[in-house]
């Protein structure tokens, strides 16, 4: 019996078999953000935990400063979610006096850097006006989706308002990535 | 042409090739609840059809009396979305007569349940605070993410009331995992 | 050495090994979109972009007329984000009014057509009721399964309302699926 | 209750190498991460790395890479460290320590165990 | 790697007296933890994020800092407080300890 005999009959040369269980992947999880300093117009990236609790790298998946670095072109699954929570915003006070305005907003952005290319990608954005009325509101953005990443390349979690972000369990804000 | 021919360079003994078709994989889809007893401060687990319509379980993947069990060890993707409806809460009322109060919630938590600890473990949870307005309000919370799980770990999907989850249509609250 | 050592025990016949990277697979992005007929309670299908920015499609996944074409029988995890965006809804200036009222809702639908069948099949639905109070609100739902599909399935994504459809960016409204 | 009860005292010669264990009860073995901590001649502390029983994921300091094994064996609750090619300079007493978060620090410690290497 | 320097490395207080010990990173932490242990026994969780008390710790210990700079203060020393003090950082691996600050009784 041949290897070929279980390939099947359209198998590319340049594209091998390979074991699932070595396949990068990552799935981090939310520790206290410091703040940072970060340009006006550009929300600030989430760091994460990345080895304690549900946390974990392999095969090759590394994080680094914010970022999780693809170690291996191909196409991955990339998901995150952020809980929000906050007090009420300003906008229902406004609204309260009769005086109609633009919600305030919570928003998710997975980014992608590529070090040849000096802008960064937007891959996913979730973004909700946040107009509440009760004195505490939490609710959570999630996103997940597929692309085509090239080896090298480094993906961020950036937030509108890292304060608003809730840090106290790891099953509410995450951020992961694998090959698939 | 021998077999390792399709195995990349850093293919490990310990993790053979084996086919995508073969692994364990589940999606269950909303049934009615039955009202059952749960403690005080435990979230009631919802239970599922796996078998009719939509749902299904495969390669060993099963479902028994609210759990999903786990038949190799692996990192899995597991997701849920549950859909909530009801009438207005409370908290809109209080507020109309101008009383600020803290919200109503709705929260999915998926949990993983290790036969060798008593203490569950919380995989994943959306929360989101509720304070609707209308007679009625309806919403989905959805979830997502990888974990490495054990053979014999059990997952269930729990939520925080149990009479507001929409059980009336199979794409609207379900709960699936495979094996990546 | 044989190409069966990396095969696992319970490796079946039927199922051979493949390449991942020649797994179909499609990730399609907003574009504004062109109003169209459609029959009052039947939700409006989303086109999409597949080829430019973001978007993709591969190894005989095919985009086609609003429809994803399922190129060869299998499960698929399939997922979609719709971000809409509108103005105050009626149903806050009848609130105002002291009037209770149904709210306003948005809801997705991603839908499988088998052409052997004539009535579609929803496979996830998102539905949101909709009582906004600020003057405009936007935000996502997001969904996202696995399904068994059969070669020639066509998916598309459903909309209630696709003027409220948010097609500015391809990172707030896409559309994707992946054989797993 | 919480408890890491290590293994006992152990005498081994130059150049061999030697296994320490570790067995957690009273709380999720998997919930926690092990650490393994060595102290000499009751001076400094140093950390040596950490293995995630639920991930299987470790962390070596470099100073200890090639020096120490750190594996876990889930379903008795077990860590284990592997001491490699000793010499006399890990003579040594050795600690595992569980920690949750790293905002909670190192929450439960074992007994140690005290490794002397000699001839 | 982060290096603490704690000090001063041996002090000794009165009963009733205050105590301040000081631990010192070579870059900022986010996370920083101290550990009281006894002669021939386990180090103990003592003070966590900075400034939590673990379980049993008396009141009268207290800790602060940010950055670079932290500290232990006991605001009236005790008999049963005398011990070797440790701080460790876990913001960036490996996670350090410092050389201890060992207090004893006057």
């Known amino acids: 019996l041949k290897g070929q005999e279980f390939a099947p009959s359209h198998q590319q040369v340049y594209a091998p078999l390979r074991a699932d269980g070595d396949k990068p992947r990552a799935h981090l999880t939310v520790v206290r953000q410091t703040p940072t300093q970060h340009f006006k117009n550009q929300f600030p990236a989430l760091h994460w935990e990345h080895e304690l609790g549900l946390a974990f790298t392999k095969n090759r998946m590394n994080y680094t400063n914010k970022f999780l670095l693809i170690p291996e072109s191909g196409d991955y699954f990339i998901y995150s979610q952020v809980t929000f929570r906050g007090m009420t915003s300003e906008c229902s006070e406004i609204r309260q006096a009769g005086r109609p305005n633009k919600p305030d907003s919570i928003t998710v952005v997975i980014t992608k850097v590529t070090d040849s290319y000096p802008e960064p990608t937007q891959l996913l954005m979730g973004t909700k006006s946040v107009c509440e009325v009760g004195s505490n509101w939490f609710q959570p953005i999630y996103l997940g989706a597929m692309f085509s990443l090239q080896e090298g390349d480094k993906l961020m979690v950036n937030v509108s308002d890292i304060s608003l972000v809730d840090y106290t369990k790891e099953d509410k804000t995450f951020f992961g990535a694998f090959l698939l | 042409l021998k077999g390792q021919e399709f195995a990349p360079s850093h293919q490990q003994v310990y993790a053979p090739l084996r086919a995508d078709g073969d692994k364990p994989r589940a999606h269950l889809t909303v049934v009615r609840q039955t009202p059952t007893q749960h403690f005080k401060n435990q979230f009631p687990a919802l239970h599922w059809e796996h078998e009719l319509g939509l749902a299904f379980t495969k390669n060993r993947m099963n479902y028994t009396n609210k759990f999903l069990l786990i038949p190799e060890s692996g990192d899995y993707f597991i997701y849920s979305q549950v859909t909530f409806r009801g009438m207005t809460s409370e908290c809109s009322e209080i507020r109309q007569a101008g009383r600020p109060n803290k919200p109503d919630s709705i929260t999915v938590v998926i949990t993983k349940v290790t036969d060798s600890y008593p203490e569950p473990t919380q995989l994943l949870m959306g929360t989101k605070s509720v304070c609707e307005v209308g007679s009625n309000w309806f919403q989905p919370i959805y979830l997502g993410a990888m974990f490495s799980l054990q053979e014999g770990d059990k997952l269930m999907v729990n939520v925080s009331d149990i009479s507001l989850v929409d059980y009336t249509k199979e794409d609207k609250t379900f709960f699936g995992a495979f094996l990546l | 050495l044989k190409g069966q050592e990396f095969a696992p025990s319970h490796q079946q016949v039927y199922a051979p090994l493949r390449a991942d990277g020649d797994k179909p697979r499609a990730h399609l992005t907003v574009v504004r979109q062109t109003p169209t007929q459609h029959f009052k309670n039947q939700f409006p299908a989303l086109h999409w972009e597949h080829e430019l920015g973001l978007a993709f499609t591969k190894n005989r996944m095919n985009y086609t007329n609003k429809f994803l074409l399922i190129p060869e029988s299998g499960d698929y995890f399939i997922y979609s984000q719709v971000t809409f965006r509108g103005m105050t809804s009626e149903c806050s200036e009848i609130r105002q009014a002291g009037r209770p009222n149904k709210p306003d809702s948005i809801t997705v639908v991603i839908t499988k057509v088998t052409d052997s069948y004539p009535e579609p099949t929803q496979l996830l639905m998102g539905t949101k009721s909709v009582c906004e109070v600020g003057s405009n609100w936007f935000q996502p739902i997001y969904l996202g399964a696995m399904f068994s599909l059969q070669e020639g399935d066509k998916l598309m994504v459903n909309v209630s309302d696709i003027s409220l459809v948010d097609y500015t960016k391809e990172d707030k409204t896409f559309f994707g699926a992946f054989l797993l | 209750e919480v408890q890491l009860q290590q293994s006992g005292p152990e005498l081994v010669k130059p150049g061999a190498s030697m296994k320490i264990s570790c067995k957690a009860s009273?709380?999720?073995?998997?919930?926690?991460?092990m650490n393994w901590v060595k102290q000499s001649h009751g001076k400094n502390l140093e950390w040596i790395g950490l293995?995630?029983?639920?991930?299987?994921?470790?962390n070596y300091n470099q100073k200890f890479k090639g020096k120490a094994t750190l594996t876990v064996d889930k379903t008795s609750s077990t860590a284990y460290m592997e001491l490699l090619s000793l010499t006399s300079e890990d003579s040594a007493v050795y600690y595992c320590?569980?920690?949750?978060?790293?905002?909670?620090?190192?929450?439960?410690w074992g007994q140690g165990t005290l490794v002397t290497v000699s001839a | 790697q982060i290096v603490l320097t704690q000090s001063p490395a041996i002090m000794s207080a009165s009963p009733g007296e205050k105590v301040t010990m000081t631990c010192s990173a070579s870059?900022?932490?986010?996370?920083m933890h101290w550990y009281q242990q006894k002669s021939g026994t386990s180090p103990k969780r003592w003070i966590y994020?900075?400034?939590k008390l673990a379980s049993g710790v008396p009141t009268r210990f207290s800790g602060s800092g940010s950055g670079t700079s932290y500290s232990l203060t006991i605001s009236s020393m005790e008999a049963e407080d005398a011990a070797t003090y440790y701080c460790?950082?876990?913001?960036?691996?490996?996670?350090?300890f410092g050389g201890g600050t060992k207090l004893e009784i006057k």
């Open positions: 293995i995630n029983p639920y991930s299987g994921g470790t």
């Open positions: 320590a569980s920690i949750y978060q790293r905002h909670d620090g190192i929450a439960y």
């Open positions: 870059s900022s932490v986010n996370y």
């Open positions: 460790q950082q876990w913001s960036s691996s490996p996670y350090t």
């Open positions: 009273g709380y999720s073995f998997t919930g926690y991460t």
């Open positions: 994020d900075t400034s």
